[in-house]
């Protein structure tokens, strides 16, 4: 049966009993050899008389004396079978045997569940030889004991490539309950319930479990570890923790944070990265996302013009990265910007709004009804057109571009002339006879150059003809007009 | 099914000791403490304390220290409120009430009324 | 210890109509519990932790608010809700109950 050692009892002798024969219990040993970091097991010489043999392996001798009588059967001593103690109290515990004196190299070595110990550990081992037998004493000492000292611990001897294995000492280390599993912090929905799991163990066992909230208990009663807490719902966030009590006191888990989800804050710093004429690149800083991660984002823009209808653009992105591109806008127009954002709750308010301009951009249509016609007198060709609708200028007339392509006779050459904004017509010089003429016009802003119009044909035939109608751009549908005299 | 049936009611004179029992079924005893709460006639509901089931440790409300005993008979899955020196003013229905999480009173028994008169 | 005054102590009402009865605590709480009471019965747990129904309970009645607010709600009043209804707050030891109301069908 084993025996038990409360720490309460009695320190129990170094080894069981007085060995018999010539040696005593205050005897001085004859070599001590300590062993703290990379054990290394104990040299034998000498011997004693065994002792009694118990439950360990056991050597049998095949060695007989002079007056030939077999020797008995080799074991170690029995000893304190269970040591409970409390943590970082120290622990000391032996092994001893009786080893013949005819046995030389033999050695002991320390096992802990199984596995040598070769660490630095506080092994001794002490040798108090006699005539005929050396009592060998290992002893195993930790100053402060852990958890992790917890297990089975037992004495090796190889004689003559026999083992002779120990009786185990189990060494059981008690404390304060040690958890495995703490709440962990969350972010949860307003009045919904959820889960929260605490466990601890021994020993000594067993654990049991009340939950905090609020520095208010939640279970008059322990639950035994582990223990699952189901939490109602919240209306506001709450601070969770599980105390872990058994018969050494209590440990207390970490204190929880436990989030209500809520609809972000709005979005901040919505600031214009850049403009063009028809987008606005702008960034915004998120708001608070209400322990819920974002989803996505909305851009409102609205027209500033106090005349336009009031009515809201409204265009949808991700979330990230914060940066959003806003097309299709008016040039030289200004607007105002918001930004919303969204996680699973809900839209937040508007940010606060911003105001944004387009700038100058190259006018979106070409002057309409182009219209060309000769002037032999002076020898010019005259050109009309009316400039394009305001609203698609996208910008201030500062003129326009009249592109003049002369073809004949398989020479081509163009010609551009700029003219400014006053006015809509232009004269040019005619530059071939015998040729056709081909006049484009483009409005011009600071933003750059208009589409061109469709082009307008007309013959400039050689001197000394008369009568010239004008050319003028076609109705739909008429690619290619061409005038001829 | 889980109940909580308590004994039936009690005629007694001022100075005498009433026990009233509470006797659990359906659920494990020793889980959840047993609550005692006083409902004088035409009154509310007042906590009296609770016993823990597993432990066997009392804990009474300050109106309540001194007289009032809560006890268990846990082979029998039974709480017991015991009363010394009755008085007039004792004179009330007595509910046992199992706690759940969140001081929950959450299977109540079937009461018990005790009249204290001379 | 924590008070809780309920209001109003009688509540009269006909069938079909909403009522609304309050409690309110002395100090904050994070949850409040319901108990209906009907006479020489006992006690029976109507609503755990603020807005949860116990069993068996019909989806009528509601159960709102937060920190020293709380509210049980019956959207239509029926002939069998007339009883008393308690309020009792765990947060804080003792843990109270309110003193109740009485609601009547007229």
């Known amino acids: 049966a084993i025996t038990e050692a409360r720490e309460e009892a009695k320190p129990y002798p170094l080894f069981p009993g007085p060995f018999p024969g010539s040696l005593q219990t205050d005897h001085t040993p004859l070599l001590s050899l300590p062993h703290a970091s990379g054990y290394q097991p104990a040299l034998m010489f000498s011997p004693t008389q065994p002792g009694r043999p118990h439950t360990g392996n056991v050597a049998i001798p095949q060695v007989t004396s002079v007056e030939s009588k077999p020797l008995p059967p080799l074991a170690f001593k029995h000893t304190v079978g269970h040591i409970i103690l409390s943590e970082h109290k120290g622990v000391k515990f032996n092994c001893s045997i009786s080893v013949p004196n005819i046995y030389q190299d033999t050695t002991i070595s320390w096992w802990k569940d199984g596995k040598e110990l070769l660490g630095a550990h506080h092994a001794i081992t002490q040798f108090y030889p006699d005539d005929e037998v050396t009592a060998i004493i290992a002893s195993f000492s930790i100053t402060s004991v852990q958890r992790s000292d917890n297990g089975s611990y037992i004495c090796k001897m190889k004689i003559n490539n026999e083992e002779i294995v120990s009786d185990p000492i189990y060494i059981e280390v008690q404390g304060l309950p040690h958890f495995t599993k703490q709440p962990e912090s969350m972010n949860v929905t307003r009045n919904t319930a959820f889960n929260l799991t605490c466990q601890a163990v021994g020993p000594p066992e067993p654990v049991n479990i009340f939950w905090v909230q609020n520095s208010s208990r939640v279970n008059e009663q322990p639950e035994k570890s582990p223990s699952v807490l189901t939490v109602p719902g919240l209306t506001e966030m709450a601070v969770f923790s599980c105390e872990a009590h058994n018969d050494k006191g209590l440990t207390v888990s970490k204190g929880v944070q436990i989030n209500i989800k809520a609809i972000p804050s709005p979005p901040t710093e919505v600031s214009i990265r850049n403009s063009t004429a028809h987008s606005i690149l702008i960034s915004w800083v998120p708001g608070f996302d209400g322990y819920s991660p974002f989803r996505n984002c909305s851009i409102q823009v609205k027209e500033a013009d106090p005349l336009s209808n009031g009515s809201v653009m409204i265009f949808n992105t991700s979330a990230l990265p914060h940066l959003y591109q806003i097309k299709q806008l008016q040039a030289l127009a200004n607007y105002s910007i918001g930004v919303s954002c969204m996680n699973e709750i809900g839209w937040s308010a508007v940010s606060p709004w911003i105001l944004a301009s387009t700038t100058e951009g190259a006018p979106s249509v070409a002057p309409l009804n182009v219209t060309v016609f000769l002037n032999e007198s002076s020898d010019n060709v005259d050109i009309r057109w009316m400039k394009p609708p305001t609203k698609q200028q996208d910008g201030e007339l500062v003129g326009y571009r009249i592109s003049h392509v002369w073809q004949s006779a398989g020479i081509s050459k163009e010609l551009l002339e700029e003219v400014g904004q006053n006015g809509s017509r232009a004269r040019i010089s005619v530059q071939v006879h015998n040729a056709t003429c081909t006049v484009r016009i483009a409005a011009v802003t600071r933003g750059g150059v208009g589409p061109f119009s469709d082009p307008v044909k007309i013959f400039i035939p050689a001197h000394g003809w008369v009568d010239y109608a004008p050319s003028s751009t076609p109705a739909p549908g008429n690619a290619d007009p061409v005038l001829i005299i | 099914q889980i109940q909580l049936v308590q004994s039936g009611p009690e005629l007694k004179k001022p100075g005498e000791t009433v026990k009233i029992s509470c006797m659990a079924s359906?659920?494990?005893?020793?889980?959840?403490?047993v609550t005692w709460v006083k409902q004088a006639p035409g009154q509310g509901l007042q906590r009296m304390g609770w016993?823990?089931?597993?432990?066997?440790?009392?804990t009474y409300a300050d109106d309540f220290k001194g007289r009032f005993v809560f006890s268990l008979e846990t082979s029998a899955n039974t709480a017991h409120l015991q009363i010394n020196n009755l008085k007039n003013e004792d004179t009330a229905t007595y509910f046992c009430?199992?706690?759940?999480?969140?001081?929950?009173?959450?299977?109540w028994g079937t009461g018990t009324t005790v009249t204290v008169s001379s | 210890q924590i008070v809780l005054s309920q209001s109003p102590a009688i509540l009269s009402s006909s069938p079909g109509e909403k009522v609304t009865m309050t409690c309110r605590a002395s100090?904050?709480?994070?949850?409040m519990h319901w108990y209906q009471q009907k006479p020489g019965s006992s006690p029976k747990p109507w609503i755990y932790?603020?807005?949860n129904l116990a069993s068996g309970v019909p989806a009528r009645f509601s159960g709102s608010g937060s920190g020293t607010s709380y509210f049980l709600t019956i959207s239509r009043v029926e002939a069998e809700d007339a009883a008393t209804y308690y309020c009792?707050?765990?947060?804080?030891?003792?843990?109270?109950f309110g003193g109740g109301t009485k609601l009547e069908i007229k």
């Open positions: 016993i823990n089931t597993y432990s066997g440790v009392p």
């Open positions: 100090s904050s709480v994070s949850y």
């Open positions: 359906g659920y494990t005893f020793t889980t959840h403490g």
């Open positions: 009792q707050q765990w947060n804080t030891d003792p843990p109270t």
């Open positions: 932790a603020t807005s």
């Open positions: 009430a199992r706690t759940n999480n969140y001081r929950y009173f959450d299977v």
